[in-house]
Amino acid sequence: EEELQVIQPDKSVSVAAGESAILHCTVTSLIPVGPIQWFRGAGPARELIYNQKEGHFPRVTTVSESTKRENMDFSISISNITPADAGTYYCVKFRKGSPDTEFKSGAGTELSVRAKPSAPVVSGPAARATPQHTVSFTCESHGFSPRDITLKWFKNGNELSDFQTNVDPVGESVSYSIHSTAKVVLTREDVHSQVICEVAHVTLQGDPLRGTANLSETIRVPPTLEVTQQPVRAENQVNVTCQVRKFYPQRLQLTWLENGNVSRTETASTVTENKDGTYNWMSWLLVNVSAHRDDVKLTCQVEHDGQPAVSKSHDLKVSAHPKEQGSNTAAENTGSNERNIY
C-alpha cells in the first residue's frame, strides 16, 4: 500500500507586494488522521503560518473547503504579501496524537516577493559650483525586491558614464536599496539642464522610475562685465554704462565707484533673461564732467550670489572735449538705471 505523499507542485512562486500568494499542497491519502500545518522555513526556528487543527491566522485562507469530507487539497492563500513574507514554505502532514507528530513534509515552495522600488530621489551638492567644475549627484531608491535592478544617469537626455552604484545589502534580504553617485562637469549653458536618474526593475513592467535634479539649483554662472562710455547726452554730461552679462542666479549687487569712492549701490531688479537661462543687466551712471578738473576713474563693482566682488574700470578724460568713447554692441535688450552725479 502506498504511504501518504505531500505534494507541493510549485518549486517557486513569485508575487507582487500587496497581492495574495497561493501556495499549493495536496496529499494522496486521508491516512493517517491528523492536521496539515504550513511553515515558513525549516528546522526548530520555523514559523507556523497555518494549522488546520487550531489557531487564528487572519491573513491565511484555505483555497478549498478544508472541512469537506474527502478534501485532500490543503493549498492556502496568504493575503497582502510584503517583502517580509519571502521564504520557503512547507506543507506538513501531522499524525493525530498527544502531541501531534510530524508525519511527512512537502518539498517546499519558495515564495519571492516582487516589491517596487521607491521613487528615486536625486540630490546635488550643498553649495553651488561654477562651470568647468565637476559636481556629484546622488540617487537613492529603496524597498525593492528581487535584488536585480538597473540604474542609468542622463544629462539632458544624454547618458552619463561616470558613476558608481551600490545595491545593499550584499546578502539575502527581504528588500534592497540602491545608491548611486554620478559626476557631472558643469558648462555655462547648464542653467536649464536636468540630471536624471532612471531606475528599471522587473516590477515596473518596462516603465522605469525617474528622479530629476535641476542644475539651476547647482550652478553659478559668474557675470562678465563691460563698462562703456555712451555718446554725450548734454553739454558737460557723460553717460557711462556697466553691462553685466550672462550671470546666474539673479542675486546680484552693483556698486559704482568714482576714483575709489562709493557713488551708488543698487540691486539687480529688472533683468533680462537669455535663452540659456542666464541673466543680463545694465546700470547707467551720468557723470557731470564740469565738476571734475582731473581725469575720473569709474569702477563698476559687482558682487554676485555672495561671491567676492569682481570689477571693471573706465577712465574718463576730463581734459579732452567730451566725445563718444565707446558704444553698446550688445545684442540683448537691456534694462536701465539712471543716476545724475554732481
Epitope: L30, I31, V33, Q52, T67, R69
Partner: antibody, heavy 115, light 111 residues
Framework: RQLVESGGGLVQPGGSLRLSCAAS????????ISWVRQAPGKGLEYIGT?????ITYYASWAKGRFTGSKTSSTAYLQMTSLRAEDTAVYYC????????????WGQGTLVTVSS | DIVMTQSPSSLSASVGDRVTITCQAS????????LAWYQQKPGQAPKLLIY???TLATGVPSRFSGSGSGTDFTLTISSLQPEDFATYYC???????????FGQGTKVEIK
C-alpha cells in the same frame, strides 16, 4: 459506493473469526477503515482503525485480541480469544475520525460467541 | 480514555418540535472539534449527520445542526419530521488517534 461485511456467525468461546469488509465504488488505498460493534440492545462501541501497515490502532480494550488489515478493496478484522461479551453486530465504516468521519457503513455482520 | 456522556438518554417529541440533544466530553476533544453525530434506526447501520462539531454531512437535511467546542456539544433538530424518530449517538475523539468513544445514545420517540 458501499461496504459489504461477511464472515460473521456462531463461534465458541476462545475461538477465532475473521470478518471481511469489501468496498465497491471506491478504493480503500487512501481511506482508513474503522470497525465498530453493537451488542444486542446496546450502544455503539469503537474497536479500531486500519490505515496502512504502519497506521493501525485499536481502542485500549481491543488491543491484543483484535487485528486489522486491508488491501485496496477489502478490509479484514481478525478476532481471537473470543468471549460471550464479544457477541455483537460488527460494522465496518469508511473513515478514521476527526476530519475523516465514518461516512459509509456496511450493513453489519452478527457474531455470536456461545458454546 | 475520553468518556462521552449524552443527555437525555431518551425523549418523546411530536412532529414539528425543536429537539436538542447534548453531549459532554470528560476532557476537551481533539482540536476542540473532534465530535460527530450519527443517527441509527432499528436494524440499520448508523448514518453520519454532523462532523467536526458543526459541519453538515453530504445529503443531510438542513434541519439538523451541530454546535459546541471543547467539551460541550449540541445536536439540534429544528423541526422534527416523522423519519427523524431514531437513536442518536455522538462520537468524540481524544488526543490519541485510537481514543474514539461513542456516547450511550439518545432515543427520540413519538409522543
Amino acid at each position: 459506493r458501499q461496504l459489504v461485511e461477511s464472515g460473521g456467525g456462531l463461534v465458541q468461546p476462545g475461538g477465532s473469526l475473521r470478518l471481511s469488509c469489501a468496498a465497491s465504488g471506491f478504493s480503500l488505498s487512501s481511506h482508513g477503515i474503522s470497525w465498530v460493534r453493537q451488542a444486542p440492545g446496546k450502544g455503539l462501541e469503537y474497536i479500531g482503525t486500519i490505515g496502512t501497515g504502519v497506521i493501525t490502532y485499536y481502542a485500549s480494550w481491543a488491543k491484543g485480541r483484535f487485528t486489522g488489515s486491508k488491501t485496496s478493496s477489502t478490509a479484514y478484522l481478525q478476532m481471537t480469544s473470543l468471549r460471550a461479551e464479544d457477541t455483537a453486530v460488527y460494522y465496518c465504516a469508511r473513515g478514521s475520525a476527526w476530519n475523516d468521519p465514518f461516512d459509509y457503513w456496511g450493513q453489519g455482520t452478527l457474531v455470536t460467541v456461545s458454546s | 480514555d475520553i468518556v462521552m456522556t449524552q443527555s437525555p438518554s431518551s425523549l418523546s417529541a411530536s412532529v414539528g418540535d425543536r429537539v436538542t440533544i447534548t453531549c459532554q466530553a470528560s476532557q476537551s476533544v481533539y482540536g476542540n472539534n473532534d465530535l460527530a453525530w450519527y443517527q441509527q434506526k432499528p436494524g440499520q447501520a448508523p448514518k453520519l449527520l454532523i462532523y467536526l462539531a458543526s459541519t453538515l454531512a453530504t445529503g443531510v437535511p438542513s434541519r439538523f445542526s451541530g454546535s459546541g467546542s471543547g467539551t460541550d456539544f449540541t445536536l439540534t433538530i429544528s423541526s422534527l419530521q416523522p423519519e427523524d424518530f431514531a437513536t442518536y449517538y455522538c462520537l468524540g475523539g481524544g488526543d490519541d488517534e485510537a481514543d474514539n468513544t461513542f456516547g450511550q445514545g439518545t432515543k427520540v420517540e413519538i409522543k
